[in-house]
Interface confidence: low
């Protein structure tokens, strides 16, 4: 016996969040693994005084304690539907079924005499059945449903009279079934019997307040136990080899302070309260825990030497149940002021370490949804994905023995003091109907899923690619909006005057008259900020780089009559230094912020944009931009993620979507102002970029979903696309989706009519697709009231906890970008497409692994995307070049300019193009790499500043 | 029966040092499952913790607060001492002191036992 | 820090139910303790660890506490029940205790 469970809790430091592993393995679980499904008697089979049963302490409990509940007799009549259940099982594949026997069905009164015939042939009926179809029956003897007449006659198991009858029942059941039956359980979560039965009250038979009468019943239960393990020992086991187990529940909890001795000392003992108070005496060394006899001396039974000797390893294998009743209501568990946690996992390793590394069965485990809930139990598939993950990594990483999974439940039932609130089956049940129909919920289909596939096969991304981006690709940094600033900071040659410092005497500086020298003219690195940008992008080995000019700085009054000349002339740097270097500019015009949107002052009181002015206003803005930098800029963003500024613009939907009318004049106005005006002389090009994640429904069994995804897509992309790429009006799909809500009176929002000057002014205007793409969105269909964008596109979203994500939740899901590319081409054709941002957040501030891990699986998909699906992807930009302070950590470089080391693996990937084969040449021709920079600096050199 | 009774001047200049004092009885300061802490509550506004020290000497601080506070007890006289520095007139408020329960020697279960509290003002 | 949002204020007529919530991130796996303050006097502790009731306090409290809302119940509501809320937890995190802003129940008539 081992005992060295609190080790647990001292993290391991290899742990690495890039190791996708350890969130989430794509892998099979053993052969032979054992997948089942359970239930408990008293939960499914109604019928509680049909046929001769007698009632147990439940039914008594249901009509004195649990308000508006009539009984269990609707449930889901398991004993009526037998043929239903067994159809259920066969849908979804298992190997085993754990369900009860209910004691009082068997023997009404509960002493063992002549067995309740009806009783008796029901459960022969079942087990004949399971065997016929190949599968395993693991039969509890004893899930809380104890019959009323022993707790009315000996006070139930607070009396050691229980622990005979309970043996006696036991033997019958083996004489009767054990022929068909290879793993037994005697009793279903002890724990939960002793606590809620007589300590909070919350369990039948309901009382509470006695911590000596708490104490008793589980030193009964164990005793009960541990006889009936000898019993079938020695009397069944040489004959019917099967096993015998006990079902031990636990939550599980995680310290507050994980370096913290008294934090971890606490969660140690209360794991050791709830589970090693039956795990010790069985699994471990015959007696209860050394914590719980010193702490509850007054109150805990004594074992005997000889009965410790009894108890120890009366268990042939360690079940294990870990669901929500250990976990609810919180307030009744020793949760000693630490964390509650859902890490099966841990747990997992916890009774290895403690245990001494048993055979494990999970014999209960699952979660619960609202009684409202019907066949699109969503959350459930995710919960059950994350548990199994869980189970998945326990097995192939921490050698721990678990041989066989039982998802809870079959079916939908009377959960306890929850009675039908919730539900938990995999299959729902309407039970108000007479037929009691067994519908398989999405989680049955994903279990049926899982148990086919052994495990999770990794459907979702292709094998990395060996290839390279072509020559002219664009590898780019995007830096936000770059203020600039207001005056040189080195004025030390504008100055005529000369000096001496009189360093003797009063050390000040004194001018010698009658003396000028000549000054020079100021310069592009007088500027302090530039230099530092420069040196950052020289690091970055980047052929170009996005950043957003100020438009409140360089026309403070919105329009033409004031220029702030020095701001242009600050740009103009930024730009021709960075030609210098060889890195082009992709300017962005306008990059609004949440603070005040980045509009000037004038524009913003006026109603921003929902003022149709504005756009005209940004028009003359960008005509200024595209005269002063034009010759030296080829690429322009007017607007950045104008989809976004739904998130400001949300009173209404209709100022939402007003909002964003004007925004795709402004941009029109402004391209079509280049096309006429700039591009015959500049030969530069213009789009717009919008924030382009990808949707995938949450719930892939659900169709609704997968109109919710598209429907996003719609709503999200198409709202901008449409009307620039295509036809110059917006996507009929989202028109006719906030029309149809309208009609309801489920909203008023209606999208702008749009005129056929209108259109005409829209359509057409962009030069290439530019796309903002971080992660992908898992999305449901949910019907929502209301007259807000948000609402009217009636999704929600749903952080799938096995995916690695960043600090801000941010999952990274690299193949969501591949498919976003093959959807724009789909949707609008073959062009040129530009990712235009795109980055993680890592709090990490030297050795950024999340990024490098984020930069490396998404250009993968790029370069899937450019080679296999050949979308015409013309350049990478990765966001953000330095990361802003009390804000995501989003740059390469730290606030205070220190490089972070994914600096070295974007200039890898840049050097070598991307992922080429072993050997092969990353060069591009001299003059390919280079034409450009020298028409470039060709400008910059007769441009005057 | 348990009770708590606060002690300290009525009023405070700007600047000077408040001492506040927490007299106890009906329990002892060294029972492992005792705890005390001080709460303050101005004119009509919410209540605000202060600081907190358990039975073995640990304490904790609110984090605003913390450079000005200091909490100790003499278990021998019964008392829990709060020492506010820098007073100034946003300090004035009702001071209270409360017990803490730590049931089973694990878990915080609230302050089941208040002071009827002391009104400082802070005023020049 | 640790931060409890409570709605200002609640009015309820005689005999009906008032429920008073707060709002914490993951407030489920904290035990939530919950005060009454009346016009002048200190706060008395009605609920403790979620759900729990001190000797002296009437049935009608009652608490629960799961998700990101734990809440106070007031059934059949009495005039004297007329005072400011404030629930409270123990912020593991930091050893700190965090209250509130408090919740004035007023009842009706």
């Known amino acids: 016996f081992s005992g060295d469970g609190r080790a647990i809790w001292s993290k391991n430091p290899n742990f690495t969040p890039v190791n996708e592993s350890q969130l989430f393995l794509y892998d099979t679980f053993p052969k032979n693994f054992f997948w089942g499904i359970g239930t408990g008697a008293l939960q499914v089979e109604g019928s509680w005084k049909k046929d001769g049963k007698g009632p147990s302490i439940w039914d008594h409990f249901i009509h004195t304690h649990l308000k508006n509940v009539s009984s269990t007799n609707g449930s889901s009549d398991s004993y009526i539907f037998l043929e239903k259940d067994l159809s259920a099982l066969d849908f979804i594949g298992v190997s085993f079924y754990q369900f009860s026997i209910s004691w009082p069905r068997l023997f009404p009164d509960g002493i063992v005499t002549v067995a309740n015939a009806k009783g008796l042939q029901y459960y022969s009926t079942l087990l004949d059945a399971l065997v016929l179809r190949n599968i395993e029956p693991i039969v509890t003897l004893y899930h809380w449903d104890l019959p009323l007449a022993l707790q009315e006659k000996y006070g139930g198991w607070k009396n050691d009279t229980i622990i005979d009858i309970f043996n006696d029942y036991a033997t019958y059941c083996f004489q009767m079934f054990g022929d068909r039956v290879k793993y037994w359980i005697t009793i279903h979560n002890p724990y939960l019997v002793a606590w809620h039965g007589y300590g909070t009250g919350m369990h039948a038979p309901g009382e509470k307040g006695n911590l000596a009468a708490v104490y008793t019943v589980g030193h009964n239960l164990i005793k009960a136990h541990s006889k009936v393990w000898h019993n079938y020992n020695t009397h069944f086991r040489p004959h019917q080899k099967g096993w015998l187990s006990i079902t031990l529940g636990s939550h599980w909890i995680e310290p507050n302070r994980s370096e913290n001795t008294m934090d971890i000392f606490k969660c140690q003992q209360s794991m050791v309260s709830v589970l090693g108070w039956f795990a010790n005496p069985i699994h471990g060394d015959g007696d209860y825990p050394e914590g719980m006899r010193k702490k509850l001396f007054s109150v805990l039974p004594i074992f005997s030497e000889a009965e410790k000797h009894e108890m120890r390893g009366t268990a042939d294998f360690f079940a294990f149940s870990f669901g929500p009743n250990n976990f609810k209501p919180l307030n009744t568990m020793a949760k000693m002021g630490q964390n509650v946690s859902l890490n099966l996992r841990e747990a997992l390793n916890w009774i290895k370490l403690e245990y001494n590394n048993p055979r494990i069965l999970i014999a209960e485990n699952g979660w619960f949804t609202d009684s409202r809930v019907k066949t699109e139990d969503t959350t459930a598939i995710y919960m059950m994905k994350n548990f199994l993950s869980q189970v998945l990594q326990a097995i192939r990483l921490d050698e721990i023995r678990v041989f066989g999974y039982t998802a809870w439940s079959l079916l939908d039932g009377f959960e306890w003091q929850d009675a039908y609130t919730i539900r938990r089956g995999l299959f729902y049940v309407d039970f108000n109907s007479k037929q009691k129909e067994r519908k398989p919920k999405s989680s049955a289909h994903y279990y049926k899923q899982i148990i086919r596939e052994n495990g999770f096969s990794l459907k979702e991304s292709t094998p990395d690619v060996q290839g390279q981006f072509p020559c002219d690709f664009s590898w780019g940094v995007t830096e936000s909006v770059l203020k600039p600033e207001s005056v040189a900071s080195s004025p030390q040659f504008s100055d005529p005057h000369l000096y001496v410092w009189n360093a003797t005497g009063n050390r000040l500086l004194h001018r010698v008259e009658g003396v000028r020298l000549k000054t020079r003219p100021a310069q592009c690195t007088d500027f302090v900020n530039i230099k530092k940008q420069l040196e950052m992008l020289a690091r970055m080995k980047v052929t170009h780089y996005r950043f957003a000019l100020d438009w409140a700085s360089v026309l403070p009054t919105g329009n033409l009559s004031a220029v702030n000349r020095q701001a242009l002339r600050y740009y103009r740097c930024v730009v021709s230094e960075g030609l210098k270097l060889g890195i082009s500019a992709m300017v962005t015009l306008y990059y609004p912020t949440h603070a005040h949107l980045g509009l000037p002052e004038p524009l913003l009181h006026a109603d921003g944009w929902l003022n149709p002015s504005t756009a005209e206003a940004f028009q003359a803005y960008a005509g200024l931009c595209f005269q002063e930098l034009g010759d030296l800029v080829k690429l322009w963003i007017t607007i950045n993620e104008p989809n976004r500024l739904s998130d400001i613009y949300n009173r209404s939907g209709n100022d939402t979507y007003g909002a964003a009318h004007n925004l795709l004049v402004a941009h029109a106005l402004a391209w079509r102002l280049y096309d006429r005006q700039f591009r015959p002389s500049q030969r530069g090009a213009v789009s717009l970029s919008l924030h382009a994640d990808w949707a995938e429904p949450a719930n892939p069994y659900a169709d609704s979903h997968w109109r919710a995804a598209e429907r996003f897509l719609q709503f999200e992309i198409a709202w901008f696309a449409e009307p620039l790429f295509k036809t110059g009006d917006y996507p009929a799909a989202m028109r006719e989706y906030i029309a149809s809500k309208h009609r309801r009176g489920l909203s008023s929002s209606a999208l702008p009519r749009l005129t056929e000057a209108e259109r005409r002014l829209l359509k057409g205007t962009v030069d290439f697709c530019a796309l903002n793409h971080f992660t992908t969105r898992f999305v449901m269909h949910e019907q929502l009231a209301g007259s807000r964008y948000d609402s009217d596109r009636d999704i929600q979203f749903l952080q799938d906890i096995t995916r690695l994500s960043s600090p801000t939740r941010l999952a990274v899901i690299p193949w969501g970008v591949r498919k976003l590319l093959r959807w724009v081409r789909r949707n609008y054709g073959d062009m040129d497409i530009y990712i235009t941002a795109s980055g993680i957040d890592d709090q990490a501030l030297e050795d950024d692994r999340l990024r490098k891990y984020y930069l490396g699986k998404y250009l993968q998909e790029v370069l899937k995307a450019y080679l296999i699906d050949k979308v015409r992807i013309k350049g990478y930009y990765a966001f953000k070049l330095a990361e802003e302070k009390s804000k995501p950590r989003f740059g390469f470089f730290t606030s205070d300019f220190k490089a972070k080391s994914s600096i070295q693996f974007y200039n890898k990937v840049i050097s070598s193009r991307g992922f080429p084969f072993e050997n092969s040449s990353s060069r591009c021709s001299q003059t390919q790499e280079n034409t450009e920079c020298t028409v470039c600096l060709f400008l910059v050199q007769k441009k005057p500043l | 029966q348990v009770t708590l009774k606060e002690s300290g001047p009525v009023l405070v200049k700007p600047t000077e040092t408040l001492t506040l004092t927490c007299t106890v009885s009906g329990f002892s300061l060294n029972n492992a499952r005792m705890g005390v802490s001080w709460i303050r509550q101005p004119p009509g506004k919410a209540l605000e913790w202060l600081a907190h020290i358990f039975s073995n000497d640990e304490k904790s601080y609110s984090t605003s607060l913390k450079s000005r506070l200091t909490i100790s007890k003499d278990t021998s006289k019964s008392q829990v001492v709060l020492i506010m520095t820098n007073m100034d007139p946003v300090d004035t408020a009702t001071y209270y002191c409360a017990r803490s329960v730590v049931t089973g020697g694990y878990y915080y279960d609230g302050m089941d036992v208040w002071g009827q509290g002391t009104t400082v003002t802070v005023s020049s | 820090s640790y931060v409890l949002t409570q709605p200002p204020s609640v009015s309820v007529a005689p005999g009906q139910t008032a429920r008073i919530t707060c709002g914490g991130a993951n407030i489920g796996s904290e035990s939530v303790h919950w005060y009454q303050q009346k016009p002048g006097q200190a706060p008395v502790l009605v609920v403790y660890?979620?759900?729990d009731r001190p000797s002296g306090i009437p049935e009608r409290f009652s608490g629960s506490n799961s998700g990101n809302t734990a809440t106070l119940t007031i059934s059949r509501v009495e005039a004297g029940d007329e005072a400011d809320y404030y629930c409270q937890v123990w912020d593991g995190n930091s050893d700190h205790v965090v209250f509130g802003g408090g919740t004035k129940l007023t009842v009706l008539g």
């Open positions: 660890d979620d759900s």
